[in-house]
C-alpha cells in the first residue's frame, strides 16, 4: 500500500496590478494531478502582512485570490493542495507548502514620507485629505497623491491639490462614484532633486470618515407645563435620517448643563416653571447602522428661549 502524495501548487506568486495595495495571489495546479482526474482539488491559502501575528486563511477551488494589503510593509503567503478522502479513497491528503513574498523596495528614509495624513469625507459628498511634508525635506520636495477603489480601471492622480509655499499639502477629490463600503487605497509619493522620498500607503472606507454638516432648524415646543420638546432637522445632503446619531447640549439659566445622545431629531426636556432661559445646540455623527466609525459635525447655531411663554410661541431660527 503506497502512501498517496500530492504536490504543492506551481508558480505561486503575488502580483501587484498597480492598485496601491489590492494584490492578486495566483498559482497553477500541482504537477501529476492525473492520478486525481475525478477529483475536485482545493487549495488552502494563508497570507499576512509581515509583522502581523495572525495569518488570514482561505480555502478555494480557484487558481487565484485577491485582497488588500498594507504596502508600507512586506507581504508573505503560503499555499498547499488539499485532497478530501474521496480523491484518495482513503484519508485526507495535503501537500507541503509553497511560499512566496512581496514587498515594494523602499526609497528614501522613513522621515521623508508625509506626516499626519488626515482624510475626511465631508457630508458623505466631498473627500479631502491633508498632510504635512516629511521631516527635514527641502522646499523642492513635492508630494503626489494617487488613489484607487474597486470600480476604477486604474489608479488616478489627484487633480486638485491644496498647496502651501508651492508644496502640495492636500488633495480635494472629485465626485467619487460608488466608492463607499469598499476599501479606498491611497499612495502619497514624492520627488526631490536632493534625495529620494519614501512613499506612504493608506487604506480606509469612506463611510467611516464622514463628517456631516450640523443639524438645522432648531425649535422649541411646549408639550406640557413641565416638558419642552426640542426639535431639529437633518442637514441637507445625501445622508438619510436613519444614519444619524445626535449629541445635544442644553443650558438652563446659564447654570445647568445637560448633555444627551439621541437617535431621533427630537428630545424632551423636563423643566420647571422658574426656567427663564433655555439654550441648546446639536451636532450629528453617522451611526453604527451605517458605518463603523465617524466624525462629529460642528455644533449647530445656538437656539435660545428667554422669558416667553412657550405655549404661545414656537421659536425658529
Amino acid at each position: 500500500d503506497t502512501e498517496i502524495k500530492v504536490n504543492p501548487p506551481q508558480d505561486f506568486e503575488i502580483v501587484d496590478p498597480g492598485y496601491l495595495g489590492y494584490l492578486y495571489l495566483q498559482w497553477q495546479p500541482p504537477l501529476s494531478l492525473d492520478h486525481f482526474k475525478e477529483c475536485t482539488v482545493e487549495y488552502e491559502l494563508k497570507y499576512r502582512n509581515i509583522g502581523s501575528e495572525t495569518w488570514k486563511t482561505i480555502i478555494t477551488k480557484n487558481l487565484h485570490y485577491k485582497d488588500g494589503f498594507d504596502l508600507n510593509k512586506g507581504i508573505e503567503a503560503k499555499i498547499h493542495t488539499l485532497l478530501p478522502w474521496q480523491c484518495t479513497n482513503g484519508s485526507e491528503v495535503q501537500s507541503s507548502w509553497a511560499e512566496t513574498t512581496y514587498w515594494i523596495s523602499p526609497q528614501g528614509i522613513p522621515e521623508t514620507k508625509v506626516q499626519d495624513m488626515d482624510c475626511v469625507y465631508y457630508n458623505w459628498q466631498y473627500l479631502l485629505c491633508s498632510w504635512k511634508p516629511g521631516i527635514g525635506v527641502l522646499l523642492d520636495t513635492n508630494y503626489n497623491l494617487f488613489y484607487w477603489y474597486e470600480g476604477l480601471d486604474h489608479a488616478l492622480q489627484c487633480v486638485d491639490y491644496i498647496k502651501a509655499d508651492g508644496q502640495n499639502i492636500g488633495c480635494r477629490f472629485p465626485y467619487l462614484e460608488a466608492s463607499d463600503y469598499k476599501d479606498f487605497y491611497i499612495c502619497v509619493n514624492g520627488s526631490s532633486e536632493n534625495k529620494p522620498i519614501r512613499s506612504s500607503y493608506f487604506t480606509f472606507q469612506l463611510q467611516n470618515i464622514v463628517k456631516p454638516l450640523p443639524p438645522v432648524y432648531l425649535t422649541f415646543t411646549r408639550e406640557s407645563s413641565c416638558e419642552i420638546k426640542l426639535k431639529w432637522s437633518i442637514p441637507l445632503g445625501p445622508i438619510p435620517a436613519r444614519c444619524f446619531d445626535y449629541e445635544i447640549e442644553i443650558r438652563e439659566d446659564d447654570t445647568t448643563l445637560v448633555t444627551a445622545t439621541v437617535e431621533n431629531e427630537t428630545y424632551t426636556l423636563k423643566t420647571t416653571n422658574e426656567t427663564r432661559q433655555l439654550c441648546f445646540v446639536v451636532r450629528s455623527k453617522v451611526n453604527i447602522y451605517c458605518s463603523d466609525d465617524g466624525i462629529w459635525s460642528e455644533w449647530s447655531d445656538k437656539q435660545c428661549w428667554e422669558g416667553e411663554d412657550l405655549s404661545k410661541k414656537t421659536l425658529l431660527r
Epitope: T40, I58, T60, K61, Y65, P84, W85, Q86, S91, E92
Partner: antibody, heavy 121, light 108 residues
Framework: EVQLLESGGGLVQPGGSLRLSCAAS????????MNWVRQAPGKGLEWVSA????????YYADSVKGRFTISRDNSKNTLYLQMNSLRAEDTAVYYC??????WGAGAFDYWGQGTLVTVSS | DIQMTQSPSTLSASVGDRVTITCRAS??????LAWYQQKPGKAPKLLIY???SLESGVPSRFSGSGSGTEFTLTISSLQPDDFATYYC??????????FGQGTKVEIK
Amino acid sequence: EVQLLESGGGLVQPGGSLRLSCAASGFTFSRYAMNWVRQAPGKGLEWVSAINASGGSTYYADSVKGRFTISRDNSKNTLYLQMNSLRAEDTAVYYCAKVRYGWGAGAFDYWGQGTLVTVSS
Amino acid sequence: DIQMTQSPSTLSASVGDRVTITCRASQSISSWLAWYQQKPGKAPKLLIYDASSLESGVPSRFSGSGSGTEFTLTISSLQPDDFATYYCQQYDTYPPITFGQGTKVEIK
C-alpha cells in the same frame, strides 16, 4: 440512515458559555468535514464554523472568531461547538451539517434538527 | 467575502406554476453553488449541488442552472409540498461560506 442529533442548547446570560454537541450515525463520521450553521429567529441561514475530517483544520465566521471553538471526537462520532462570551446576537437555532464532498465545507447533504440557544439576561 | 443575492424575496404562486428563483454571486464562483429548501421549524434540505446536480431523492421537477455569477432554481410544476423558503449557498471560497437571504414561495 444518516442521523445528526444536536444537544446542549438552552438559555444563557450574556457573557456566559455553552457547549453544543452533535452525535452522528449512519455514515463514516471520520471521513467527512462537518460544519455548524445557525439561524436567528425569523432570519436566514448564517454559516458559523467548519472542521475537516481529521480535525486538524478549523475555520470560523468573523462574527464568532476568538469566541467559539469547533472540535470533533472521531472515536465518539461527535462534533462539538464550545461557545464563550455569548452575546444577544448569538441567539439562534444551531444546526450541525455534514459536508457532501470537500475538505472543510461544501454542499451540506445532511442536517441535524437544530438546538436553540437563547442569550438573554 | 462573496455576497449572494437572491431574488425575489417573496414569490406568490399557484399549484402547477413554473417557478424560477435567481441567485447572483458578487464574483465568479464557477459552479460551486447549492440550493436548499426549508420549511418552518425544520432543518434545511439539500436540493441541488454543484449548480445543477440533483440530490438523491429530490423530485425531478427541481432543477438548477447557471455558472459564474448567475444561477437559477426552477420548479417546473409547483406542488403543495413545495411552499417553503429556498436558499442558495456558495462554497467556492471560504471562510466564510455564504448563503443568499432566502426566497419565500407562498400560495397566491
